[in-house]
């Protein structure tokens, strides 16, 4: 603790100029004071001034008023500083002395004589209010007042609380009269060192280093840091926790960029063709006759179906076609013949059979030839006999199918299972997909072939909804949800009436 006992001398009256021993001062009593402050004593005794002592210079002769003086010699009020907790009680001895010597330091002069003394004992609380008193004896009167105040930066009823106002990163506060801290606006905490963030700033996801600020932690955004940041590249999805990509209805895939309802959203198929939500691009167009192209946007030539028979040549017209028939044939498609077997109409060794009592004929063609007159060599690939993208090749009298990887059989109709050689380690489940086998891994493993043991089981927190099965190892986030029928989304959280497909990657 630290404080100051202050004594203000106001007036001293010694009209007859007498000393305590009854003698008079010549030419008058040149008066100075000695003050002794000590702990409370029921009976004041001589001894050390435990709380401090002070002397004044000569303040006047006989009777005089003492003016306030703030500096230099003769300071008034008198200051008695202490460096301890103020006990609330005290004893004070004020002595008036006459000196024949030096005005400024009279206590050092020989021959000083006591004029009078007063003793005050009692209690005194710390405070700014002056306590005024007056003491009389037969010869003198002293008017004075006194108080105890705390030193700068000390507070409380005993001046025991140290408090220094500050405004830096260890505190932003002023001091209350009791020494407690009063935080400056925008600051809080025991030491007023914690800023009060922008109102509404999310407690966990945001913070601040100065008042009315809201700085977002990684994965969060917005003025109040209450909006999660979805996975980078998330197209048609949202998040409830950072880096998530929960697909909007009708969208799928890791980045929610696969349109599950492309047909409805975009109507890509033209010219009355049928659209189905399937295929590598998310949709397939089935064209009406006379149209071709990925979107059935290309009108076929009217002659594309080879409508002219018996070697007739086809000419496209605006909305139809016209057949130019060879000699001996007539009709819209040159289907009627004016020839008979007598005209040897069958080529390439075809045998002629008469019909309608010899008014027409029919050719029976040898292998590898076709047409009304066996005039066409058979292209065994025209019927697209090769399945699953196989390539058809004419080989003499026969044809062969060259199959894509993963398929076999005469017509590439048989699927070779990539999973047959069990490529998935650690009990992973194998899926035959168009681009090769894919493994879904049991908990604790990841990697293309479930070959990597992971220390953190991403499925442990149960991230999949609606009864979906959780697998690890199929994505950067280390888990996938295999949705049951009727649910989609990275965590199978969206119900849709869509057929089941390969598991959504979370």
């Amino acid at each position: 603790g630290s404080g100051i006992f202050q004594l203000r001398l106001q007036e001293f009256v010694n009209q007859r100029g007498m000393l305590a021993n009854g003698q008079s001062c010549e030419p008058g009593c040149r008066t100075f004071f000695r003050i002794c402050l000590k702990h409370f004593q029921a009976t004041f005794s001589e001894g050390p001034c435990t709380f401090g002592n002070v002397s004044t210079p000569v303040l006047g002769t006989n009777s005089f008023v003492v003016r306030d003086k703030n500096s230099g010699s003769g300071r008034n009020p008198l200051q008695l500083p202490f460096n301890f907790t103020w006990p609330g009680t005290f004893s004070l001895n004020i002595q008036a002395w006459h000196t024949p010597g030096d005005d400024l330091r009279p206590e050092t002069s020989p021959g000083n004589s006591l004029i009078s003394q007063i003793i005050i004992q009692g209690s005194l609380a710390v405070g700014k209010i002056w306590r005024t008193d007056e003491q009389n004896d037969t010869l003198t009167r002293l008017s004075y007042s006194y108080r105890v105040i705390c030193s700068d930066n000390y507070y409380g009823e005993s001046c025991s609380r140290l408090c220094k106002k500050r405004d830096d990163h260890f505190g932003h506060y002023e001091c209350q009269p009791d020494g407690s801290l009063s935080c400056l606006p925008g600051w809080t905490g025991k030491y007023c060192d914690q800023p009060i963030c922008l109102s509404g700033c999310h407690e966990q996801n945001g913070y601040c280093s100065k008042p009315d600020e809201c700085i977002c932690r990684p994965g969060w955004q917005g003025r109040l840091c209450n909006e999660c940041i979805p996975h980078n590249g998330c197209r048609h999805g949202t998040c409830s926790i950072p880096w998530q990509c929960a697909c909007d209805e009708g969208w799928g895939g890791l980045f929610c960029d696969q349109d599950l309802n492309y047909c409805t959203h975009h109507s890509p198929c033209k010219n009355g063709s049928t659209c189905s939500n399937s295929g590598p691009k998310g949709y397939t167009c089935t064209c009406l006759p006379g149209y071709t192209g990925e979107h059935c946007e290309l009108g076929l030539s009217k002659c594309a179906s080879n409508p002219c028979r018996n070697g007739g040549s086809c000419k496209d017209q605006e909305n139809s076609y016209h057949c130019l028939c060879p000699p001996g044939y007539y009709g819209q498609h040159c289907e009627h013949s004016t020839l008979t077997c007598a005209d040897s109409p069958c080529f390439n060794g075809g045998s002629c059979r008469e019909r309608n009592q010899g008014s027409s004929y029919a050719c029976e063609c040898p292998p590898n030839f076709t047409g009304s007159n066996c005039e066409k060599k058979v292209d065994r690939c025209t019927s697209n006999p090769c399945a699953n993208g196989g390539q058809c090749q004419n080989r003499g009298p026969s044809r062969t199918c060259r199959c894509r990887p993963g398929f076999t059989g005469t017509h590439c109709e048989l699927h070779i299972s990539d999973c047959a050689r069990s490529p998935c380690a650690h009990g992973g489940t194998c899926h035959d997909l168009e681009n090769g086998p894919v493994c879904t891994c049991p908990a604790g493993f990841s990697g293309r072939r479930c070959e990597v043991r992971i220390t953190h089981d991403a499925c442990a927190s149960g991230p999949c909804f609606n009864g979906a099965t959780c697998y690890t190892g199929l994505s950067p986030n280390n888990f996938v949800c295999n949705c049951p029928y009727g649910f989609v989304g990275s965590r199978c959280e969206f119900p849709v009436g869509l057929p089941p497909s390969f598991p959504w990657v979370a």
């Epitope: 700068d152 930066n153 140290l162 220094k164 106002k165 500050r166 405004d167 830096d168 990163h169 260890f170 505190g171 905490g189 030491y191 060192d193 914690q194 913070y207 601040c208 280093s209 700085i215």
Partner: antibody, heavy 121, light 106 residues
């Protein structure tokens, strides 16, 4: 008991950047009661405060060094770091990291053992 | 910039009292810490908040601070107290160390 340990190269060439890391053990760097400071002492001279950082990343620098100093914190590693760019021979000193306690009104109650960094070509 | 001034050296006989001053403008309005540093060692906090001792610091170390001067007092000085002593205060957000005082125990 809290311990601080400075680490980094002991020799840096003039005009290059001095980089030091302080690893805190026995306590969390994310406590709200502490700032984490860097102080240096040239050979035979007194202490000079460089700057400090709070776990949230708030930094305070000595104005005489501010243009060259960067202090950063990595709460996941319980570390904080000092970078001092464009060094000269005058930056040769023992560099200390220390914990500054709010409760102690900014007094530094724990110090690293210090690491001598010499700037020389 | 704010400066703290200390006497370069103070000599004291064993068992006597050593007083080290630290002066700065209105220093009494700031909290002062004192550090002891022995050769080849890191500084050790001996006084904080003007006059408080951390646990483990002997009672012979005391501090005061008023006006423009803070004082570290070592009463009953022992040979082991021979060291450099630094005062430290905060001027707004900047830490400021005194120039240091070498205490020699004669």
């Amino acid at each position: 008991e809290v311990q601080l340990q400075e680490s980094g190269p002991g020799l840096v060439k003039p005009s290059e950047t001095l980089s030091l890391t302080c690893t805190v053990s026995g306590g969390s760097i994310s406590s709200s009661s502490y700032y984490w400071g860097w102080i240096r002492q040239p050979p035979g001279k007194g202490l000079e405060w460089i700057g400090d950082i709070y776990y949230t990343g708030s930094t305070y620098y000595n104005p005489s060094l501010k243009s060259r100093v960067t202090i950063s914190v990595d709460t996941s590693k319980n570390q904080f770091s000092l970078k001092l760019s464009s060094v000269t021979a005058a930056d040769t000193a023992v560099y200390y990291c220390a914990r500054e306690d709010v409760i102690l009104r900014g007094g530094s109650d724990y110090w690293g053992q210090g690491t001598l960094v010499t700037v020389s070509s | 910039s704010y400066e703290l001034t200390q006497p370069p050296s103070v000599s004291v006989s064993p068992g006597q009292t050593a007083s080290i001053t630290c002066s700065g403008q209105r220093l009494g309005d700031k909290y002062v810490s004192w550090y002891q540093q022995k050769p080849g060692q890191s500084p050790v906090l001996v006084i904080y908040e003007d006059s408080k001792r951390p646990s483990g610091i002997p009672e012979r170390f005391s501090g005061s601070n008023s006006g423009d001067t803070a004082t570290l007092t070592i009463s009953g000085t022992q040979p082991m107290d021979e060291a450099d002593y630094y005062c430290q205060a905060w001027d707004r957000d900047v830490g400021v160390f005194g120039s240091g005082t070498k205490v020699t125990v004669l």
